[in-house]
């Protein structure tokens, strides 16, 4: 921001009324009036160019310093070209000297040169040559000097003429202030510019109404330079929740809008499924039946729990069931849907039911499922199972009601045994199998059926209560098809896969475990 100038002395604006002191009295400097642009203008002028040894002084009135530390002196003046006088005026000069003196009181007409300190020699950039003078073209020069730090109550300026033809049209003395400033929602007070060029006065700012320093942020500060300019802004203020920045102020959010945190962002319109907010709202309440999860941003619409999974099927495969379902028709407005599968088993004879989570196995953990299918295995034969698939989202925990669909399935067969070849020889095959432990109590015997590959007319059957059997009297180097099936009180269980096992050839050495 531009510096503010506080004027202490303005000769041009005073209309010749200041009555400055001239020394020696009645010689040298003289107050004159002229006409420029049809307006009267006053000037202090001297033009003793034909006589040598000029020492003419013009002293201002005493100027009260006030709060100024460094003053700026702006001079507007004209100097005639020494060559514009007949014979060149050998003693003529084209410069004058600027002085100042500090004092705590006004000395009146008591003028003492020795009290004055020279500021500078003032030289014109442009001199008024004969043709300019004749044509009334005033070649106005502007020079500025500064003095500081000042410490006394007031000061004088003085102008020493040493034989020039000069007119002072304007003498303006001022000091600079950094003006009151609103920046980054912080108010900085009007501050007097310091006196030393390298130094910058640090000024603390105050947040405007309804603005605060953001958490972890720096307090607003600016630096007031010597020239009255604000520099190096540090920190900032931001509008508090419920308020937004409008130009240099924080304005309450309009009804139907909200802002939930200290930030630079504007107020946002209340999202879907919220009630109309009042002025200055920090949030928008959800409509009845709609909710906001703790982690949901305030800008997100309010949502509700999903409806039940749309379509659920349970396909039995022996002692396994594959559950498949489709997503809910109403997601509740959310994308974080997960599914939970629970299992209940009932004994047909007694009608007694109970949870079966501990006795079954799921293809993946049954809670927090994101996919829409799961396989349940280790089911007991001749048991009724009911599976419940519940759809949940981020706000389901905020209501007591649940959204689920159920499917029931009856398991009539044991799971097919898993068969392994334990060993073989030229005339025998040793076979073992296994079924899930929960089903083993239901098995009465295991039936092993085998036949030569390619012979569809005859087969052999062996029954056993154990989990292995050795099939002997077999032909060497021959492939046999082997299947194992559990027998229960209610009938046959599911048969295993048909396995192909081959006996060893006569050249083979002894039995070989596989």
């Amino acid at each position: 921001a531009q510096g503010k100038e506080v004027v202490l002395l303005d000769f041009a604006a005073a209309g010749g009324e200041l009555g400055w002191l001239t020394h020696p009295y009645g010689k040298g400097w003289d107050l004159m009036q002229n006409i420029m642009n049809d307006m009267p203008i006053y000037m202090y002028s001297v033009c003793n160019v034909m006589s040598g040894d000029q020492d003419n002084w013009l002293r201002t009135n005493w100027v009260y310093r006030g709060e100024a530390e460094r003053i700026f002196i702006e001079l507007k003046f004209t100097v005639r070209d020494c060559n514009s006088f007949p014979g060149g005026a050998s003693s003529c000069k084209e410069t004058f000297n600027l002085y100042y003196a500090e004092s705590d009181l006004d000395y009146g007409t008591n003028f003492q040169k020795r009290l004055f300190t020279k500021i500078d020699t003032i030289a014109p950039d442009e001199i008024t040559v004969s043709s300019d003078f004749e044509a009334r073209h005033v070649k106005l020069n502007v020079e500025e000097r500064s003095v500081g730090p000042l410490t006394r109550k007031g000061f004088y300026l003085a102008f020493q003429d040493i034989g020039a033809c000069v007119a002072l049209l304007s003498v303006r003395v001022y000091y600079k202030k950094c003006p009151e400033l609103l920046q980054s929602l912080a108010r900085f007070p009007e501050t007097i510019a310091g006196s030393d060029a390298p130094s910058l006065a640090t000024v603390a700012g105050t947040c405007v109404d309804h603005a605060v320093v953001p958490p972890g942020g720096e307090e607003p500060r600016m630096h007031c330079a010597v020239d009255g300019e604000w520099l190096v802004p540090i920190g900032q203020c931001l509008c508090q929740a419920g308020y937004e920045k409008v130009e240099d102020a924080c304005q309450a959010c309009s009804p139907g809008f909200f802002k939930f945190e200290v930030s630079e962002s504007p107020c946002l319109e209340c999202p879907e499924h919220t009630l109309p907010s009042p002025e200055g709202a920090t949030s928008c309440e959800c409509e009845e039946g709609f909710f906001r999860a703790p982690q949901d941003p305030m800008s997100m619409p309010c949502t509700r729990p999903p409806s039940a999974p749309h379509y659920l099927t349970a396909v039995g495969m022996g002692a396994k069931v594959e559950l498949r379902w489709t997503p809910p028709q109403d997601s509740g407005g959310r994308e974080d849907i997960v599914y939970s599968v629970t299992c209940e088993q009932c004994w047909p004879e007694s009608g007694e039911c109970g949870p079966c989570e501990s006795s079954v196995r799921y293809s993946e953990p049954p809670h927090g499922l994101t996919r829409t299918s799961v396989t349940v295995s280790d089911l007991e034969p001749h048991m009724n199972y009911t599976f419940t698939v519940e759809a949940r989202n981020g706000v389901s925990g905020l209501v007591t009601s649940r959204s689920f669909r159920t499917a029931s399935v009856s398991i009539n067969q044991t799971e097919p045994p898993k068969v392994r070849l334990e060993g073989r020889s030229t005339t025998s095959l040793s076979v073992s199998w296994s079924i899930p432990p929960p089903q083993q109590s239901r098995v009465w015997k295991y039936e092993v059926t085998y036949r030569k590959k390619g012979d569809s007319n005859s087969y052999n059957v062996r029954r056993t209560e154990g989990f292995s059997v050795t099939l002997d009297d077999l032909a060497p180097d021959t492939t046999y098809l082997v299947q194992v099936q559990a027998l229960t009180q209610e009938g046959q269980g599911a048969g295993s896969k048909v396995h192909e096992f081959q006996t060893l050839s006569p050249e083979g050495s002894g039995s070989l475990a596989v």
Epitope: M32, Q33, N34, V49, R80, F85, F133, R136, C165
Partner: antibody
Framework: EVQLLESGGGLVQPGGSLRLSCAAS????????MAWVRQAPGKGLEWVSR????????HYADSVKGRFTISRDNSKNTLYLQMNSLRAEDTAVYYC?????????????????????WGQGTLVTVSS | DIQMTQSPSSLSASVGDRVTITCRAS??????LAWYQQKPGKAPKLLIY???NLHTGVPSRFSGSGSGTEFSLTISGLQPDDFATYYC?????????FGQGTKVEIK
């Protein structure tokens, strides 16, 4: 020595025209502002017109504006006053006058000039 | 236009007298004032410019003073050659105006 010599005056009828000349010598004519000043018989002095050192600007008294024209020829060191539509009240001795700002020991010139050097004058009589 | 009024319009004085002629401007003219001397049948001669500055070759018995609207020409010790008509002229405005003149006669 500075010398200004006017000529061209005489008797002229109202509405008539006359051209006055002023021959300058003894100074650098092209440095001087030149003017015409008149004096009616038994009356005081009245400024008529002025011209700058190089031919401009020119100024006129309200009483002659639009009728009189001032001009100069620096190569001939001569000043002129062309007078048209002459009236009885234009009857006067017409003086040629000059001003050299170099002799004016002042930092800023006044808006107008005073007259350092004068000719002896030429009489213009407007009568029927 | 700025009007210039001289007083008196005529005066009688003896050789050696101190004579003062005044000139009043209708508005402030600072020190932009000149004084001329004119003898019958002759051209005017410049005496004083810028209210108080003596023109080259003018005797020092002539002096001028004043500023603003009130000005005076003083002849300290009137000489026989000084009996003439004296005119003031303002050059603060482009219409350079003269006073009506003051005639100094022998008593």
């Amino acid at each position: 020595e500075v010398q200004l010599l006017e000529s061209g005056g005489g008797l002229v009828q109202p509405g008539g025209s006359l051209r006055l000349s002023c021959a300058a010598s003894g100074f650098t004519f092209s440095h001087y502002m030149m003017a015409w000043v008149r004096q009616a018989p038994g009356k005081g002095l009245e400024w008529v017109s002025r011209i700058g050192p190089s031919g401009g600007p020119t100024h006129y008294a309200d009483s002659v504006k639009g009728r009189f024209t001032i001009s100069r020829d620096n190569s001939k060191n001569t000043l002129y006053l062309q007078m048209n539509s002459l009236r009885a009240e234009d009857t006067a001795v017409y003086y040629c006058a000059g001003y050299d700002s170099g002799y004016d020991y002042v930092a800023v010139a006044g808006p107008a000039e005073y007259f350092q050097h004068w000719g002896q004058g030429t009489l213009v009589t407007v009568s029927s | 236009d700025i009007q210039m009024t001289q007083s008196p319009s005529s005066l009688s004085a003896s050789v050696g007298d101190r004579v003062t002629i005044t000139c009043r401007a209708s508005q402030s003219i600072s020190t932009w004032l000149a004084w001329y001397q004119q003898k019958p049948g002759k051209a005017p001669k410049l005496l004083i410019y810028k209210a108080s500055n003596l023109h080259t070759g003018v005797p020092s018995r002539f002096s001028g003073s004043g500023s603003g609207t009130e000005f005076s020409l003083t002849i300290s010790g009137l000489q026989p050659d000084d009996f003439a008509t004296y005119y003031c002229q303002q050059y603060n405005a482009y219409s350079r105006t003269f006073g009506q003149g003051t005639k100094v006669e022998i008593k």
